[in-house]
């Protein structure tokens, strides 16, 4: 069982009651996927200076972030949702050092989905957090057109059809 006895606090003098307070948080839908709204409090809590980031079992830690490498294969959108369900996102690569870390931990030479797709709305390659790709750092081989999603292979980024099935990487 996942449960043992509860922690019961009893007060022997007088009775106590507390009003329950609930906070509601909304979601924001973007490009068929659901991007989560993050409250100010969440943003402040995300990386408190005095808290060391420790990743869960099965996740690898690098530069204060956690990475999960899939073993199965899915389309880009299914991979996107898979990460979202784990309150993470498809991999966003910030620099070549991060790319080197990723490549070191990829044990195969096949394509792997990352959190980058071509949005017809902006007519540009966009990371899943909404930021544009830095063309000074990364070059994407292949067509930049609707229904194009990015996959990495041997430290290079390729444009692939979003419905193709590859492994993927989640990050939080």
């Amino acid at each position: 069982l996942l449960v043992s006895q509860g922690v019961l606090l009893k007060c022997q003098k007088g009775s106590c009651s507390n009003a329950t307070q609930y906070e509601d948080t909304g979601d924001l839908k973007v490009n068929n996927g659901t991007r989560r709204n993050i409250s100010n409090k969440d943003l402040c809590a995300s990386r408190s200076a005095d808290q060391t980031v420790l990743c869960q079992s099965e996740w690898l830690k690098y530069q204060g972030k956690c990475y999960w490498f899939s073993n199965e294969m899915k389309s880009w959108s299914d991979s996107y949702v898979y990460c979202l369900e784990r309150k993470s996102h498809l991999l966003i690569i910030h620099d070549q050092l991060e790319m080197a870390f990723i490549q070191k931990n990829l044990r195969q030479l096949n394509y792997v989905w990352i959190g980058l797709n071509f949005t017809s709305l902006k007519m540009t390659w966009t990371w899943v957090d909404g930021s544009p790709i830095d063309s000074k750092i990364f070059f994407i081989k292949g067509p930049a057109k609707e229904n194009s999603c990015a996959a990495i292979k041997e430290s290079k980024i390729f444009s692939e059809t979003c419905s193709s099935v590859f492994k993927w990487i989640c990050q939080y």
Epitope: T25, T34, R36, Q51, N71, V81, L84, R86
Partner: antibody, heavy 116, light 110 residues
Framework: SLEESGGDLVQPEGSLTLTCTAS????????MCWVRQAPGKGLEWIGC????????TYYASWAKGRFTITKTSSTTVTLQMTSLTAADTATYFC?????????????WGPGTLVTV | DVVMTQTPASVEAAVGGTVTIKCQAS??????LSWYQQKPGQPPKLLIY???TLESGVPSRFKGSGSGTEFTLTISDLECADAATYYC????????????FGGGTEVVVK
């Protein structure tokens, strides 16, 4: 807010379906979860459904096969329970995991009692 | 499945005192741990999430700490209003997802 309904007295080996109804928000991409509490005992997680397009479900290992969570509308989720035994006697709560980066059940229903 | 274990089984403290509740996960859950307060006849109420972040409206007397497999809830300056049952809940978010609860300590506030 959330409210559970359908709790009842049921015979051993019987089945029962509980409903969780939301008001004040629609299910978009939340986890809607079921938790139970036997009389005088602790909280026990049963399972959750992701109410986004995937509709993925996750269950405690002991609940797989006998318990099924389904999203039946934009404001209702059900818990189907089969082959019930006396050990399933409990108050059943539904809870919503907040739709943000962090894991937390920030809205709970008052619970509904199931007696086997 | 990840198993959460809360300790000790029982503790007694005076009003104004401090209570420390420990929660151990059977494998690393990072900082994905919440603490709840439950009073008889009521549903649980969220106190702390992400191991140390106070939910809105919760007094700062409640403090969460820890990461990985070891977590602690400390309630200082105990008040009568703190009479309740406290639970930790971990979230495991890898190939499978689970939300196990722990249990733990009966605390009597004198």
């Amino acid at each position: 807010s959330l409210e559970e309904s359908g709790g009842d007295l049921v015979q051993p080996e019987g089945s029962l379906t509980l409903t969780c109804t939301a008001s004040g928000f629609f299910f978009s991409s939340y986890y809607m979860c079921w938790v139970r509490q036997a009389p005088g005992k602790g909280l026990e997680w049963i399972g959750c459904i992701y109410t986004g397009s995937s509709g993925s479900t996750y269950y405690a290992s002991w609940a797989k096969g006998r318990f099924t969570i389904t999203k039946t509308s934009s404001t209702t989720v059900t818990l189907q329970m089969t082959s019930l035994t006396a050990a399933d006697t409990a108050t059943y709560f539904c809870a919503r995991d907040a739709g943000t980066t962090y894991w937390r059940y920030n809205i709970w229903g008052p619970g509904t009692l199931v007696t086997v | 499945d990840v198993v959460m274990t809360q300790t000790p089984a029982s503790v007694e403290a005076a009003v104004g005192g401090t209570v420390t509740i420990k929660c151990q996960a059977s494998q690393s859950i990072g900082s994905d741990l919440s603490w709840y307060q439950q009073k008889p006849g009521q549903p649980p109420k969220l106190l702390i999430y992400t191991a140390y972040t106070l939910e809105s409206g919760v007094p700062s007397r409640f403090k969460g700490s820890g990461s990985g497999t070891e977590f602690t809830l400390t309630i200082s300056d105990l008040e009568c209003a703190d009479a309740a049952t406290y639970y930790c809940q971990g979230t495991y978010r890898s190939s499978s997802i689970s939300w196990p609860f722990g249990g733990g300590t009966e605390v009597v506030v004198k």
